[in-house]
């Protein structure tokens, strides 16, 4: 079977304050069985956006329907983008366990806010 | 409002153990780090242990191997199980959460561990 | 583990001056400092982020500076709320997270 890439093709991103943002993720596998996440930041602290098994999320939208079981498009919408919101974005495979364990990371895709225009 | 509360202090003997609890409100908690820092009297900050969003749990040296942190996601609840204290160990201890640049935003109260023969 | 070193231990400063302390760290953090104010029987509370970036609702008169080792805090003018004790903290990306040892503002 192919090994999985998780391929975040915009290094950055940029939105104007008020605007909604579109993170691109997409895997060239199904396999390992388990979750994507999205994570805003690394490390110990990074912050949970997005868990195809829990929410809800309520700023955060998927752009495909990712309950369908052969999809491998992991791209989020986040609405009503604030300058809160800027920092680097992860999208995250984790293997199916008790509990899942993190398998491979995207590369990150970094979100700046511009000032709304006036 | 962000909201934390800290309870489960006390006096006890060295060698004995304690179990705080971290009551969180106020903000999606399965979504953030959180973390124990704790405050001798009269003293300065020293981080103690964090535990990630997806359970990965760090120590500082000096408790590694005697204190054990976890989180219920169904409580929005953290906890600190203390074992072997020391009387190095009384202090207020904080519950905190994590931003994620590694700052600690909301703090709770504390709650006074003493460790005393 | 990064040590963080403050001074001067006590600041004794008059309201309405200028208060200015520094933190130096023992090996470069980039601009991954904060600080924190802390009153008598009360949690700390987050004042700066990012050596220079203020958190939500802190006024104004608080400003961060520095990068690498050596970082300042400066209150422009100081407010009778503003005594207390401030502590710095590097926050690199992974643990231990380590604080310095505090510098207490007092009313001259």
């Known amino acids: 079977e192919e090994e999985l890439q998780i391929i975040q093709p915009d290094k950055s991103v940029s939105v104007a304050a008020g605007e909604s943002a579109i993170l691109h993720c997409t895997i060239t596998s199904l396999f390992p069985v388990g979750p994507i996440q999205w994570f805003r930041g690394a490390g110990p602290a990074r912050v949970l956006i997005y868990n195809q098994r829990q929410g809800p999320f309520p700023r955060v939208t998927t752009v495909s329907e990712t309950t369908k079981r052969e999809n491998m498009d992991f791209s989020i919408s986040i609405s009503n983008i604030t300058p809160a919101d800027a920092g680097t974005y992860y999208c995250i495979k984790f293997r199916k366990g008790s509990p899942d364990t993190e398998f491979k990371s995207g590369a990150g895709t970094e979100l700046s806010v511009r000032a709304k225009p006036s | 409002d962000v909201q934390l509360v800290e309870s489960g202090g006390g006096l006890v003997r060295p060698g004995e153990s304690l179990r705080l609890s971290c009551a969180a409100s106020g903000f999606t908690f399965t979504n953030y780090a959180v973390t124990w820092v704790r405050q001798a009297p009269g003293e300065g900050l020293e981080w103690v242990s964090l535990?990630?969003?997806?359970?990965?749990?760090y120590y500082a040296d000096s408790v590694k191997g005697r204190f054990t942190i976890s989180r219920d996601n169904s409580k929005s609840t953290l906890y600190l199980q203390m074992n072997s204290l020391r009387a190095e160990d009384t202090a207020v201890y904080y519950c905190a959460k994590v931003t994620w640049k590694n700052v600690f935003d909301y703090w709770g109260l504390g709650t006074l561990v003493t460790v005393s023969s | 583990e990064i040590v963080l070193t403050q001074s001067p231990g006590t600041l004794s400063v008059s309201p309405g001056e200028r208060a200015t302390f520094s933190c130096r760290a023992s090996?470069?953090?980039?601009?991954?400092l904060a600080w924190y104010q802390q009153k008598p029987g009360q949690a700390p509370r987050l004042l700066i982020y990012?050596?220079?970036t203020r958190a939500t609702g802190i006024p104004a008169r608080f400003s961060g500076s520095g990068s690498g080792t050596e970082f300042t805090l400066t209150i422009s003018s100081l407010q009778s709320e503003d005594f207390a004790v401030y502590y710095c903290?590097?926050?690199?990306?992974?643990?231990?997270?380590?604080f310095g040892g505090g510098t207490k503002v007092e009313i001259k």
């Open positions: 903290q590097q926050h690199t990306d992974w643990p231990p997270y380590t």
């Open positions: 535990i990630s969003v997806t359970g990965t749990t």
């Open positions: 990012d050596a220079n």
């Open positions: 090996q470069t953090v980039g601009s991954k």
